[in-house]
């Protein structure tokens, strides 16, 4: 089950996952000037079973300069491909975390990918927070957040982390020295949804995709 919202924002902190639960989707985003190739996927998908998980699909980008003017570009939809990529490994992932049953490692970068990675997490996913460079962590509790399902709605637990403006940085589990989050800050358009919409996608199906008719013009 996909989490309806993004993990909570903590001032002066970034988050990342050590491993991605089966069912997680990663958008195939290309950097400016590039687009998804005709046979490319819309998403990568962490799939598999308790003993082995890997990423379905491969993200591929091509120069926008070659774009067909008739807009016949046809990306492969996210939901469908069953072609397996090789097992993903990343030096950014502690082995014990990435080897969790039913989890995938961080996918390696693809050529001309966007600067920020957009993940769609699933229930049970845990993300870890660290203060950005120049800020120090004051822990009141776990510096992590978990996507949980409660009464048919998904929500992220609140990480107990405060980042203060001192020149020391906290570290992610398993890291020997501070480093910037590899995926940067995910798009956080919906970060305020917890308070504003109460996860309408779960509770108001008809309202989630409201369709209506606009005025008709005579021609």
């Amino acid at each position: 089950e996909l989490c309806d919202d993004d993990p909570p924002e903590i001032p002066h902190a970034t988050f990342k996952a050590m491993a991605y639960k089966e069912g997680t989707m990663l958008n195939c985003e290309c950097k400016r000037g590039f687009r998804r190739i005709k046979s490319g996927s819309l998403y990568m998908l962490c799939t598999g079973n308790s003993s082995h998980s890997s990423w379905d699909n491969q993200c591929q980008c091509t120069s926008s300069a070659t774009r067909n003017t008739t807009k016949q570009v046809t990306p492969q939809p996210e939901e469908q491909k069953e072609r397996k990529t090789t097992e993903m490994q990343s030096p950014m992932q502690p082995v014990d975390q990435a080897s969790l049953p039913g989890h995938c490692r961080e996918p390696p970068p693809w050529e001309n990918e966007a600067t920020e990675r957009i993940y769609h997490f699933v229930v049970g996913q845990m993300v870890y927070y660290q203060c950005v460079q120049g800020y120090r962590a004051l822990h009141r509790g776990p510096a992590e957040s978990v996507c949980k399902m409660t009464h048919g709605k998904t929500r992220w637990t609140q990480p107990q982390l405060i980042c203060t403006g001192e020149m020391e940085t906290s570290q992610f589990p398993g890291e020997e020295k501070p480093q910037a989050s590899p995926e940067g800050r995910p798009e956080s358009e919906t970060s305020c949804l917890v308070t504003t919409t109460d996860f309408q996608i779960q509770t108001e199906m008809a309202a989630t995709m409201e369709t209506s008719i606009f005025t008709t013009e005579y021609q």
Epitope: D5, T74, E78, E79, Q80, K81, E189, E204, M209
Partner: antibody, heavy 104, light 110 residues
């Protein structure tokens, strides 16, 4: 017939710009037909060959709304039109549908 | 003519198990995920099965999906009167570069 029409689909409760939205047609008493998809983040659009050139799919991410538009309606466009979020594995959330009736 | 082939109708009595088939080709069912949808009379379709055999939360475990080669099937066990609806299968088609649906199966609970 001959008139233009634009119907809309508003998404809420999720990150609208980061999921693909599909439009699906269902003619009276018939089955489902996939028309095309749009990625609201950059308005990248893909059409089914059957609907290419017949309709235009667009999006306004500032108001989290996707549109399906006809420049010149035909009687055969009479149908129920659904929007749905396309995710890894299927179309997981559907709008309640908009009934378009074209009659002279 | 639908790209995926489903029987137009199926029926069963309460408590029975019914199976609905969906036949395709190597360019759709054979190489891509299959999803199933339930459309109750007068309502929008609802995702029932995704990625061949995964049930979204809220879908009873009486519904199950499977796939073998270029065919897929939806099984409904412990049939109930509220299961009376139209059922559609769907898959991405590599040749057509789009999602294709089956023609739909009308399930009647006798």
């Amino acid at each position: 017939p001959g008139e233009s029409l634009k119907i809309s689909c508003k998404g809420s409760g999720y990150s609208f710009t980061t999921y693909w939205i599909a439009w699906v047609r269902q003619m009276p008493g018939k089955g489902l037909e996939w028309m095309g998809i749009i990625y609201p983040g950059d308005s990248d659009t893909t059409y089914s060959p059957s609907f290419q050139g017949q309709v235009t799919i667009s999006a306004d991410k500032s108001i989290t709304t996707t549109y399906l538009q006809w420049s010149s309606l035909k009687a055969s466009d009479t149908a129920m039109y659904y929007c749905a979020r396309q995710v890894a594995g299927g179309l997981d959330y559907w709008g309640q549908g908009t009934l378009v009736t074209v009659s002279s | 003519q639908s790209v995926l082939t489903q029987p137009p109708s199926a029926s069963g009595t309460p408590g029975q198990r019914v199976t609905i088939s969906c036949s395709g080709s190597s360019s759709n069912v054979g190489s891509n995920y299959v999803s199933w949808y339930q459309q109750l009379p007068g309502t929008a379709p609802k995702l029932l099965i995704q990625r061949n055999n995964r049930r979204p939360s809220g879908v009873p475990d009486r519904f199950s999906g499977s796939k073998s080669g270029t065919s897929a099937s939806l099984a409904i066990s412990g049939l109930r009167s509220e299961d009376e609806a139209d059922y559609y299968c769907a898959a991405w088609d590599d040749s057509l570069s789009g999602v294709v649906f089956g023609g739909g199966t009308k399930l009647t609970v006798l």
